[in-house]
Structures are given as structure tokens and as C-alpha cells.
């Protein structure tokens, strides 16, 4: 019968010929009367056999990630008679893995959006690297994730690649972050290979800023001939938030004379001061009103950012018109 052990050949061997093992018949008494032959894919080109001894050699560098096993056939012939000594037999040569592949992130580019001011522990995104090495061969394809850039705002779970928030962020200070994640095989042991990926994390806006007047004092003038409904000027607040979170409403906080009104231009986000009652220079030639501004939409949980509306003082000078 045939005698052999399992055949393994390490991938990426640089030697011109590498002894893998021996195939022999138990009828072979070692007097060189038998001839061994190798057949099948790779026979003669990748693997050769010593016809006299049955020793098998790899004569080419192998790449397990390209092909991890070879199924070959062996024959043994009595040289004297030309007849088969043993029935033809199939055997397998397995290519054993070495750690020759670095982890790769296949789903790049990564991009995620997370609301600003999200609490610590909020899930941002999961990144996944793959390693072409053999997951069943030691730690060659066992990966550990780590953060190369992004502290102290982000953290990554070492075994899952899940990125989480580790510190609150304010979009108004910085609206996007580049996080660099490294995946290392060999669970980080010596000889490990690594790959990196970048994750663009954008912060979406929440209404954490109240509108604030650009000026603490506005000066406007109104002619005593101006009819009611006249727009006498504009006031403006700014809000560091964006979009709907920056929409605002202006109103009068104090006008004992009840002479003016303020309406909001929702396109420009300006407050328009309107004359509500006609003025008379001879009766009163200047007015003071206090205006306030508030956001249009404020969720209950963000009300803490909106205590005490911003106010401004408006000095309104009445212009004299010569009366006939």
C-alpha cells in the first residue's frame, strides 16, 4: 500500500526547491526498482517528484491566498515490468498560511453623521477590515482596531470596529472630524501587519444656541409724517445654529407708548420695526423700545440653552416736518 503523511508547504517560500515529504509504496525495498510519477494540476510545474525515492518538492513560490490546496495523483511502476505496483492514488498538498496580508478596509470611504452634543457612548459607525490570511491559522487574520486620530472625541471598540463618541462635541466650534482607524492582525503581537482607514464624521446641528442681537443699541428715525404701517428700520440677531435651528422671531418686550411693533422677515431673519401709531414731534421727539428675539423651534430638551431671550434697545428719533 501507499505510505505518506499529510503534505503541507508554507506559502511564499523563496528557495528554488522545497522538500515537502515522501510518497512511497510499502513494497519498495529501496533498490531503485520502482519509478514514481506525479500527475494532475501543478505536477511538473509547481511540484516535482524524485522518480526513484518518491520525494516531493515544491519548485515554485506558492501563494495560499491564490490557491490553498492542490489535489494530485501518484503512480508507482515496476521498472522491470512497466506495470503499476499500486493503484493510482489521489493526495492533497495543503499550502500553509503565513502572515503576508495586511488588513484592508473594503467599504471605504467611510462617512457618518451624528448630532452635535450627543452623549458619550453614542454609536457613530462600524468599520470592518478583512484580512486575506487564514482565519483558522493562528492569529494571522485576527484583528484588533485602534484609534490613530480622533481622541478625545471618539473611541473604537478593539474587537468590533464600532466607533463611539467619547466626548461631547459642539458643531459651532468644529463641524467635522477626520478619524483614522488602524486594524492590526496577529492581535497586535510582534510581526503584525496593519491597515488604516479614514472616517469623515460630520456633526449635524441641534438647537443649542439662542439668537443674540448683533448690537446692544439700534438707532432709527421716523418722520412725523410717516403713516401707520411704515417700516422704519430693521434690527438683526445672529444665531450660530443653522437651518431651521436658526429661524427666529422678534417681538417687542417693552414699549410703554405702544407706538411701534416688530415683525419678522423669515427669509432674511431680520426684525422690521413698524410704526403702529402716528408720531408727533411736538408731543414726543424720541422713543425708546426694547426688543427681544427667540428661536422659532426649540425642543423641550434644549430649552436649557434658551433661558433669557436676548434683548436690544432701540432709540427712535422723530424727525420734524414743517407744518403749513
Amino acid at each position: 500500500g501507499w505510505v505518506w503523511n499529510q503534505f503541507f508547504v508554507p506559502e511564499e517560500m523563496n528557495t528554488t526547491s522545497h522538500h515537502i515529504g515522501q510518497l512511497r509504496s510499502d513494497l519498495d525495498n529501496g533498490n531503485n526498482s520502482f519509478q514514481y510519477k506525479l500527475l494532475g494540476a501543478g505536477a511538473g510545474s509547481t511540484f516535482i517528484i524524485d522518480e526513484r525515492t518518491g520525494d516531493i518538492y515544491a519548485i515554485q513560490k506558492l501563494d495560499r491566498e491564490e490557491r490553498s490546496l492542490y489535489i494530485l495523483r501518484a503512480q508507482v511502476i515496476d521498472i522491470a515490468t512497466g506495470r503499476a505496483v499500486e493503484p493510482e492514488s489521489e493526495f492533497v498538498i495543503k499550502v500553509s498560511d503565513i502572515n503576508d496580508n495586511e488588513p484592508k478596509f473594503l467599504d471605504e470611504p467611510y462617512e457618518a453623521i451624528v448630532p452635535e452634543m450627543s452623549p458619550e457612548g453614542t454609536l457613530v459607525i462600524q468599520v470592518t477590515a478583512s484580512d486575506a490570511d487564514d482565519p483558522s491559522s493562528g492569529n494571522n487574520a485576527r484583528l484588533l482596531y485602534s484609534l490613530l486620530q480622533g481622541q478625545p472625541y471618539f473611541s473604537v471598540e478593539p474587537t468590533t470596529g464600532v466607533i463611539r463618541i467619547s466626548s461631547k462635541m459642539d458643531r459651532e466650534l468644529q463641524d467635522e472630524y477626520w478619524v483614522i482607524i488602524q486594524a492590526k492582525d496577529m492581535i497586535g503581537q510582534p510581526g503584525a501587519l496593519s491597515g488604516t482607514t479614514s472616517v469623515l464624521i460630520k456633526l449635524s446641528d441641534v438647537n443649542d444656541n439662542k439668537p443674540i442681537f448683533k448690537e446692544s443699541l439700534y438707532r432709527l428715525t421716523v418722520s412725523e409724517s410717516a403713516p401707520t404701517g411704515t417700516s422704519i428700520g430693521t434690527i438683526m440677531a445672529y444665531d450660530n445654529d443653522i437651518g431651521e435651528n436658526a429661524e427666529m422671531d422678534y417681538s417687542i418686550e417693552e414699549d410703554d407708548s405702544q407706538t411701534f411693533d416688530i415683525i419678522t422677515n423669515h427669509e432674511t431673519q431680520e426684525g422690521i420695526v413698524i410704526l403702529k401709531k402716528k408720531v408727533d414731534f411736538e408731543h414726543q421727539n424720541h422713543y425708546g423700545i426694547r426688543a427681544k428675539v427667540k428661536n422659532h423651534h426649540v425642543p423641550e430638551q434644549l430649552m436649557k440653552y434658551h433661558t433669557e431671550a436676548s434683548t436690544t434697545f432701540i432709540k427712535i428719533q422723530v424727525e420734524d416736518v414743517d407744518e403749513p
Epitope: 443699541l217 407708548s257 411736538e282 414726543q284 421727539n285 424720541h286 425708546g288 434697545f313 428719533q317 424727525e319
Partner: antibody, heavy 119, light 107 residues
């Protein structure tokens, strides 16, 4: 600190002219409306004129309208009062005063300059 | 024009006494646009009270203002030697006018 220093007062004959100056320092002159107020010897205070922070509006007491002109030079931080056709009743100490930012009262005053109109 | 009438013309008091000065307007003063000043001899006026009741910067709390409409008052709770001076009320509801003054003198 805020300082207002008047100058230009003196003795002048009726019908003549005089220009008073008020040098301002210690605050942003271009942000404040400025006034002139006078006080005849032994009498009370009388408001004279106001000029807006940007110099675009001026108002005068009826007693000086058409004779006095208030002006300002922001580059020199100086307020002026040009007084023409002076009369004996214009004799007074003239004060420049700063109007409060959020109000119309006068929070800072100069030390005053005396104008005497007599023949 | 709004005319302001102050009373009394002169108030003779001793240091430590309470002084109450009155200012009456010929027509209603809008939005409590009324101020009080004092003037020591040879000096410029100094703002004490604005908006009828708000103390100006650096003014001690013995000075208080009250009133609305046409009747206003300045109270000095306990007179100090430096408080003996002439006091003026001023309206700035319509243009600017001053009262004729109240002299607070040492008794």
C-alpha cells in the same frame, strides 16, 4: 476714563461769533450722541443743542435755532458749537455733555467754558 | 415744551437728615424719562438718577428716585456733607428741559 474738555469761551461783543470746542477722550466718541447745555450766571440749566452719533441729525432749542450750529469731527474726537449773532442773553457757562447709550440723560459733563456777550 | 417745576426752592437741613425733593411736569412724562442731577458750586452737574428711579454708576444708595406721569421725587435718606448742592430734575420725553433747581443747604 471719560473726559470732556471745553474750550473757546471768552468775551465777545453782541452780534459777533464764537466757536466752542469740546475734546472727548476715554470712550468711543463716534458711538454717542452729544449735547451742549448752558447755565447763565446764578441761573439754572438750559439745554441748547444735540447732534447724533453719526452727525446726520441736529436739534436745537428755540432760543438758539438759526444762530447756533452744532457739529462734530470724529477723526479729532471733537464736538463744536458755532455761535453766530450772539446776544447778551447768550452769556453763560457752556457745557458739553454725553448722552447715555441706552437713555437720553447726560452721564458725563465737561467742566464748562464761559461765554460773556457784552459791549 | 414740557415745563418742570421743582419744590421747594431751597431746603435747609442738617447732615444725617432725610431730604425729599419734588419735581412736577406740566404734562405727562412718557416712559418715566426723567433724570436728577446735582451741582456743587463751581462744578459741572453730575447724573444721579435716570429713568425716574435707576441710580447712575457710582451713586450711593442713599439717593433714590420715584414717581411717574407728572409727579416725581428724589429722596436722600441721610444727608452727607457733600450732598449740600443744587439739584435739578430733567425730562427727556420730549426734547430736553430742566427744572429751575432746588438748593439743599446746611441748616
Amino acid at each position: 476714563q471719560v473726559q470732556l474738555v471745553e474750550s473757546g469761551g471768552g468775551v465777545v461783543q453782541p452780534g459777533r461769533s464764537l466757536r466752542l470746542s469740546c475734546a472727548a477722550s476715554g470712550f468711543t466718541f463716534s458711538s454717542y450722541d452729544m449735547h451742549w447745555v448752558r447755565q447763565a450766571p446764578g441761573k439754572g440749566l438750559e439745554w441748547v443743542a444735540v447732534i447724533s452719533y453719526d452727525g446726520t441729525n441736529e436739534y436745537y432749542a428755540d432760543s438758539v435755532k438759526g444762530r447756533f450750529t452744532i457739529s462734530r469731527d470724529t477723526s479729532k474726537n471733537t464736538l463744536y458749537l458755532q455761535m453766530n449773532s450772539l446776544r447778551a442773553e447768550d452769556t453763560a457757562v457752556y457745557y458739553c455733555a454725553r448722552e447715555r447709550y441706552f437713555d437720553w440723560s447726560f452721564d458725563y459733563w465737561g467742566q464748562g467754558t464761559l461765554v460773556s456777550v457784552s459791549s | 415744551e414740557i415745563v418742570l417745576t421743582q419744590s421747594p426752592g431751597t431746603l435747609s437741613l442738617s447732615p444725617g437728615e432725610r431730604a425729599t425733593l419734588s419735581c412736577r411736569a406740566s404734562q405727562s412724562v412718557s416712559n418715566t424719562y426723567l433724570a436728577w442731577y446735582h451741582q456743587r458750586p463751581g462744578q459741572a452737574p453730575r447724573l444721579l438718577i435716570y429713568g425716574a428711579s435707576s441710580r447712575a454708576t457710582g451713586i450711593p444708595d442713599r439717593f433714590s428716585g420715584s414717581g411717574s406721569g407728572t409727579d416725581f421725587a428724589l429722596t436722600i435718606s441721610s444727608l452727607e456733607p457733600e450732598d449740600f448742592a443744587v439739584y435739578y430734575c430733567q425730562q427727556y420725553s420730549n426734547s430736553w428741559t430742566f427744572g429751575q433747581g432746588t438748593k439743599v443747604e446746611i441748616k
